[in-house]
């Protein structure tokens, strides 16, 4: 593909809606940052369409995105992370639509991992812990986490807890006895950076003890 449209194609292209959204991930691969963009309309014909970012880059004026199926992607150390860049959808040399974006305001953290729940019998509670790669990062270190849990049978009845640490205690008396629970966690930038929620961590499943009939307490 040349990346250039015939005149008729260009006229057709101008009738389409090329609105798009992007997110950045900082220090996602060592000191490399990434930027991912996609069209809002999944039915856009992306043949011959390219994305380009210009401005607020180190040592270069512009960078072209790589196309990976329906998304457009850059991984580079060349983001200045200061000021606004211009991100454009192009057909050949013609820009169809552009957005001015500060990459530090569209940050999507990496998903938390190693989520686990440990029951403490003496304390009658559950200690939830998880890990995040952001603790080791230079830039996006401060995150707000959203822990969501539900009884497995209650499909859409999630309870959410926001916290800034990676440890949470759930009191046993707040949970149903002898029930299977699903729990998951995601993160969003908090302080210094703005952006979007990460993907959810893989879910963790745990069972609450049964009630001990003689004492009225859970086992």
């Amino acid at each position: 593909e040349s990346g250039y449209a015939q005149n008729g194609d260009l006229e057709d292209a101008e009738l389409d809606d090329y609105s798009f959204s992007c997110y950045s991930q900082l220090e996602v691969n060592g000191s490399q940052h990434s930027l991912t963009c996609a069209f809002e309309d999944p039915d856009v014909n992306t043949t011959n369409l390219e994305f380009e970012i210009c401005g607020a880059l180190v040592e270069v004026k512009c960078l072209n995105f790589r196309k990976l199926q329906e998304i457009y992607f850059i991984e580079t150390k060349k983001f200045l992370l200061i000021g606004k860049s211009n991100i454009c959808v192009k057909v050949g040399e013609k820009s169809l639509t552009c957005k001015k974006i500060d990459l530090t305001t569209i940050v999507k953290p990496e998903a938390p991992f190693d989520l686990s729940v440990i029951y403490r019998e003496g304390a009658n509670d559950f200690v939830v812990t998880f890990n995040t790669s952001h603790l080791q990062k230079k830039y996006v270190k401060v995150l707000m986490h959203d822990v969501a849990y539900r009884q497995e049978k209650d499909e859409n009845k999630w309870t959410h807890v926001n916290l800034s640490s990676t440890k949470l205690t759930l009191l046993q008396r707040k949970l149903q006895p002898a029930a299977m629970y699903e729990i998951k966690v995601r993160s969003i930038p908090d302080h210094y950076f703005k952006g979007f929620w990460s993907e959810w961590s893989p879910s963790y499943y745990f069972r609450t003890p049964e009630i001990n009939n003689s004492s009225g307490e859970m086992d």
């Epitope: 607020a56 200061i82 606004k84 500060d102």
Partner: nanobody
Framework: EVQLVESGGGLVQAGGSLRLSCESS????????MGWVRQAPGKEREFLAA????????HYSDSVQGRFTISRDNAKNTVYLQMNSLKSEDTGRYYC???????????WGQGTQVTVSS
């Protein structure tokens, strides 16, 4: 109507320090990148330092890295340039700039003169 006002310049001995301030009256200050640029006599403007909207990201030219520090106070709409170990070649007019948009600073102050005597 004046939107960026620099202060803190003056005459200083080589090896000395100065702290420049720049107060902005631009409504978008807290979401704008800020920077400092200098112009030595008979030379072009030279980028020195820039800082992102939150203060988390900074960038320096090789000529001032390790000697100058840029910072900001979004509550006071002010950006600072702490200049240490000054050299005679640091002499010039120091300009504050705001809103780095696609490699162009959108707003400029009138500048403040810094003279380093040896």
């Amino acid at each position: 109507e004046v939107q960026l006002v620099e202060s803190g310049g003056g005459l200083v001995q080589a090896g000395g320090s100065l702290r420049l301030s720049c107060e902005s009256s631009i409504s978008t200050f807290s979401s704008d990148a800020m920077g400092w640029v200098r112009q030595a006599p008979g030379k072009e403007r030279e980028f020195l330092a820039a800082i992102g909207w939150s203060g988390a990201v900074t960038h320096y030219s090789d000529s001032v890295q390790g000697r100058f520090t840029i910072s900001r106070d979004n509550a006071k709409n002010t950006v600072y340039l702490q200049m240490n170990s000054l050299k005679s070649e640091d002499t010039g007019r120091y300009y504050c700039a705001e809103d780095y948009d696609t490699d162009v600073w959108q707003y400029w102050g009138q500048g403040t003169q810094v003279t380093v005597s040896s």
